[in-house]
């Protein structure tokens, strides 16, 4: 059985944003390599990242097949240069990940304000509908396609000359808000899935202000 000492992976952690999903773990390998397997609760195990010296593995291609499924991964440790030299008749060391349900747990990426348009005392603010790596009929779905009405956006807006913020919400990607004529406003948006218990909110988008390039103004 040799005298090579392998150690099991630990601190297995899912890092996922807008369904781009990477499994990370420790330790940095010394004289060992790793292979990852992923499975749904009821499905078969699929191997990824064969005999790698990395401590991360991109599992996006697997989880986007069904983002509402619950996944489990495990990381195997093998002696470098001799992956047959493991434990009892080749049984390797391995560690199981926490369970991961992409639809419920993937972080919402920072949204972007695509445009805003002022028509008199109303401003239409449009949030960019970010493309994900989830496919349907060979096309990539947007965040709205995947989450539907589960996803809302909160708009924070305020006069450039003051700090008092107002909020608006939408379950589309557009806001129509009332503004004071002649005033410049600044905007920031946040993606929210109210039904979630974890990772409910994204970080705020970069602030966009009227009088800058993104806006379009039409005085009526």
């Amino acid at each position: 059985s040799g005298t090579t000492n392998t150690v099991a992976a630990y601190n297995l952690t899912w890092k996922s944003t807008n369904f781009k999903t990477i499994l990370e773990w420790e330790p940095k390998p010394v004289n060992q390599v790793y292979t990852v397997q992923i499975s749904t609760k009821s499905g078969d195990w699929k191997s990824k990242c064969f005999y790698t010296t990395d401590t991360e593995c991109d599992l996006t291609d697997e989880i986007v097949k069904d983002v509402k499924q619950t996944y489990l991964a495990r990381v195997f440790s093998y002696p470098a240069g001799n992956v047959e030299s493991t434990g009892s008749a080749g049984e390797p060391l391995y560690e199981n990940s926490p369970e991961f349900t992409p639809y419920l747990e993937t972080n919402l990426g920072q949204p972007t304000i695509q445009s805003f348009e002022q028509v008199g005392t109303k401003v239409n603010v449009t949030v960019e509908d970010e493309r994900t790596l989830v496919r349907r009929n060979n096309t990539f779905l947007s965040l709205r396609d995947v989450f539907g009405k589960d996803l809302i956006y909160t708009l924070y807006y305020w006069k450039s000359s003051s700090s008092g913020k107002k909020t608006a919400k939408t379950n589309t990607n557009e806001f129509l808000i009332d503004v004071d004529k002649g005033e410049n406003y600044c905007f920031s948006v946040q993606a929210v899935i109210p039904s979630r218990t974890v990772n409910r909110k994204s970080t705020d988008s970069p602030v966009e202000c009227m009088g800058q390039e993104k806006g379009e103004f039409r005085e009526i």
């Epitope: 040799g2 392998t6 434990g87 009892s88 008749a89 049984e91 060391l93």
Partner: antibody, heavy 119, light 107 residues
């Protein structure tokens, strides 16, 4: 809490069969390597069989190879040992035990079930 | 098959004394694959040490393991009344095998 409970032991005649069961609670048998270990009266521990985490690979002690079969049922979270062509020397307390993936050792054991092979 | 030979067969000691148990392998064993168990009459074995020197969860620090290659040792620094039992070493190499056991009895 994490627990294993064996059943199915009893008195059986030589040449007959018996199936032992081991029900797990607090963890999933299909995520870990699972073993059967036996102990003849007044003797030491003897490893019997192993089913890997993958449920496909199986290993057996030479003394039981071809007669015993280890298996598991994911839906019942249960480990089995099918024992055929039993012999007097198979008389023992049979324990099921778990090997977690992270190290080479059996960290959870059942209380044991007694098999007596006698005519 | 790797054969594990434990010595002594029986160790007679008093509470508070130090116990040193030996396990010798017929060929080199990776320390990752060496474990120690305690068994009391009528009970299942209990994992004490894995990886030759790592204590299992809930095991008091008076138990320690050491060794490499073919020679491994379990040490109980100060025997408590509940430590009197049979101790087995086990290797997880090409096939899993146990040593014959060492009985630690009250002198």
């Amino acid at each position: 809490q994490v627990q294993l409970v064996e059943s199915g032991g009893g008195v059986v005649q030589p040449g007959r069969s018996l199936r032992l069961s081991c029900v797990a609670s607090g963890f999933t048998v299909s995520n870990d390597g699972m073993h059967w270990v036996r102990q003849a009266p007044g003797k030491g521990l003897e490893w019997v069989a192993l089913i890997w985490y993958d449920g496909v690979n199986k290993n057996y002690a030479d003394s039981v190879k071809g007669r015993f079969t280890i298996s598991r049922d994911k839906s019942k979270n249960t480990l089995y040992l099918q024992m055929n062509s039993l012999r007097a020397e198979d008389t023992a307390v049979y324990y099921c035990a778990r090997r977690p993936g992270t190290f080479y050792g059996l960290d959870v054991w059942g209380q044991g079930t007694t098999v007596t092979v006698s005519s | 098959e790797i054969v594990l030979t434990q010595s002594p067969g029986t160790l007679s000691l008093s509470p508070g004394e130090r116990a040193t148990l030996s396990c010798r392998a017929s060929q080199s064993v990776s320390s990752s694959y060496l474990a120690w168990y305690q068994q009391k009459p009528g009970q299942a074995p209990r994992l004490l040490i894995y990886g030759a020197s790592s204590r299992a969860t809930g095991i008091p620090d008076r138990f320690s393991g050491s060794g490499s290659g073919t020679d491994f040792t379990l040490t109980i620094s100060r025997l408590e009344p509940e430590d009197f039992a049979v101790y087995y070493c086990q290797q997880y190499g090409s096939s899993l095998t146990f040593g014959g056991g060492t009985k630690v009895e009250i002198k």
